[in-house]
């Protein structure tokens, strides 16, 4: 096995910081898994740099990542998902930095979707529901969800609720009347698999009813 790089390139390379982070997504495209890595320093010159993963693979000892702009990724069914893999940044055959990672501990779920809020007049509450593709998955099925909501005018005043189901009830009396609210949700692995928060779902906007003066309740 051989590869090469100019000596000058290697000397320059050793001056740089090649720290990187990765996340995995299991069954992200049918039965295919993905692994995405990127340098923590956005200014790293990636021209001759490649990522390689070795170990805990089926069929092959090592795989090369595909480069797309500033990210490197692999989409394959061939992750064993048992034991640690060695992920290296390489110039030719020279490894600049490596990390031993168990892909089951860096899982980033897919973002929840179909978030909606329905007001129940009789119950004086709001039923928040959303969907997740993980209900259909074989591996990462159990998630913790983080529902965040705020009054639209309160830019950074988010209220967070953690839940394991895909349904949440918000009591009307806990919300301001006649106000516009923004709500969104994200997920994180919660059983066996470990990792990171998903991206946020698209936000959903809803308005609370006005207070009915005679009863002191919202319309």
């Amino acid at each position: 096995e051989s590869g090469y790089a100019q000596n000058g390139d290697l000397e320059d390379a050793e001056l740089d910081d090649y720290s990187f982070s990765c996340y995995s997504q299991l069954e992200v495209n049918g039965s295919q898994h993905s692994l995405t890595c990127a340098f923590e320093d956005p200014d790293v010159n990636t021209t001759n740099l490649e990522f390689e993963i070795c170990g805990a693979l089926v069929e092959v000892k090592c795989l090369n990542f595909r480069k797309l702009q500033e990210i490197y990724f692999i989409e394959t069914k061939k992750f064993l998902l048992i034991g640690k893999s060695n992920i290296c940044v390489k110039v030719g055959e020279k490894s600049l930095t490596c990390k031993k990672i168990d892909l089951t501990t860096i899982v980033k779920p897919e973002a929840p979707f179909d978030l909606s809020v329905i007001y129940r007049e009789g119950a004086n509450d709001f039923v928040v529901t959303f969907n997740t593709s993980h209900l259909q998955k074989k591996y990462v099925k159990v998630l913790m969800h983080d529902v965040a909501y705020r009054q639209e005018k309160d830019e950074n005043k988010w209220t967070h609720v953690n839940l394991s189901s895909t349904k949440l009830t918000l009591l009307q009396r806990k919300l301001q009347p006649a106000a516009m609210y923004e709500i969104k949700v994200r997920s994180i692995p919660d059983h066996y698999f470990k990792g990171f928060w998903s991206e946020w779902s698209p936000s959903y906007y809803f308005r609370t009813p006005e207070i009915n003066n005679s009863s002191g309740e919202m319309d």
Partner: antibody, heavy 122, light 107 residues
């Protein structure tokens, strides 16, 4: 449709050099690892070299390491094999081959050229 | 380096026969094995990869199996067009390696 066409084979004396080319069409060359595989007359298949999709990594068996160099020009849709210090045992039909899977490095080959004969003899 | 031992080197069979070719590797290749068919004067054709996945367009009479170091190509009912030479190949690690080949001849 996918096509691989080798050229550059011929008769060369021991110690001589030859450059093989493989012109490809019908797919995006830059998406694929590519390989050269040879077959001596009446013998089995022998892997000669592989180059990664980016061209940054090259692989050789000990039998040709230091004598053969694989390269690619994605813009010209071409793969090359520069063969130096040729020996009688390098006599073979040389095939260029494309893996079934794009990217990553799964090296099983679904498309092969027709082959070009290299004869090393004095 | 991974060594490949393919057997038999040749066999004689009749149309309709069940034919089995084996390939043994010197170390576990985790199903990183392919099978090819080659006819005289032609380039090899991919039959099977991932030890047991039939390549598109390959007749279902061909099948691959095995794991660890032992792999098998089976032709369930030999047809006239199947008389050829068959090679296994490991792609688990570099250097890539082929078996010595099995020539299937008409009895």
């Amino acid at each position: 449709q996918v096509q691989l066409v080798e050229s550059g084979g011929g008769l060369v004396k021991p110690g001589g050099s030859l450059r093989l080319s493989c012109a490809v069409s019908g797919f995006t060359l830059s998406d694929y690892y590519m390989a050269w595989i040879r077959q001596a007359p009446g013998k089995g298949l022998e892997w000669v070299s592989t180059i990664s999709a980016s061209g940054l990594r090259t692989y050789y068996p000990d039998s040709v390491k230091g004598r053969f160099t694989i390269s690619r020009d994605n813009a010209k849709n071409s793969l090359y094999l520069q063969m130096n210090s040729l020996r009688a045992e390098d006599t073979a039909v040389y095939y260029c081959a494309r893996p079934l899977s794009a990217h990553y490095g799964f090296n099983y080959f679904d498309y092969w050229g027709q082959g070009t004969l290299v004869t090393v003899s004095s | 380096d991974i060594q490949m031992t393919q057997s038999p080197s040749s066999l004689s069979a009749s149309v309709g026969d069940r034919v089995t070719i084996t390939c043994r590797t010197s170390e576990d290749i985790y199903q990183g094995l392919a099978w090819y068919q080659q006819k005289p004067g032609k380039a090899p054709k991919l039959l099977v990869y991932s030890a047991n996945t039939l390549h598109i367009g390959v007749p279902s009479r061909f099948s691959g199996s095995g794991s660890g170091t032992d792999y098998t190509l089976t032709i369930s009912s030999l047809q006239p067009e199947d008389f050829a030479t068959y090679f296994c190949q490991q792609y688990y690690d570099y250097p890539l390696a082929f078996g010595g080949g099995t020539k299937v001849e008409i009895k």
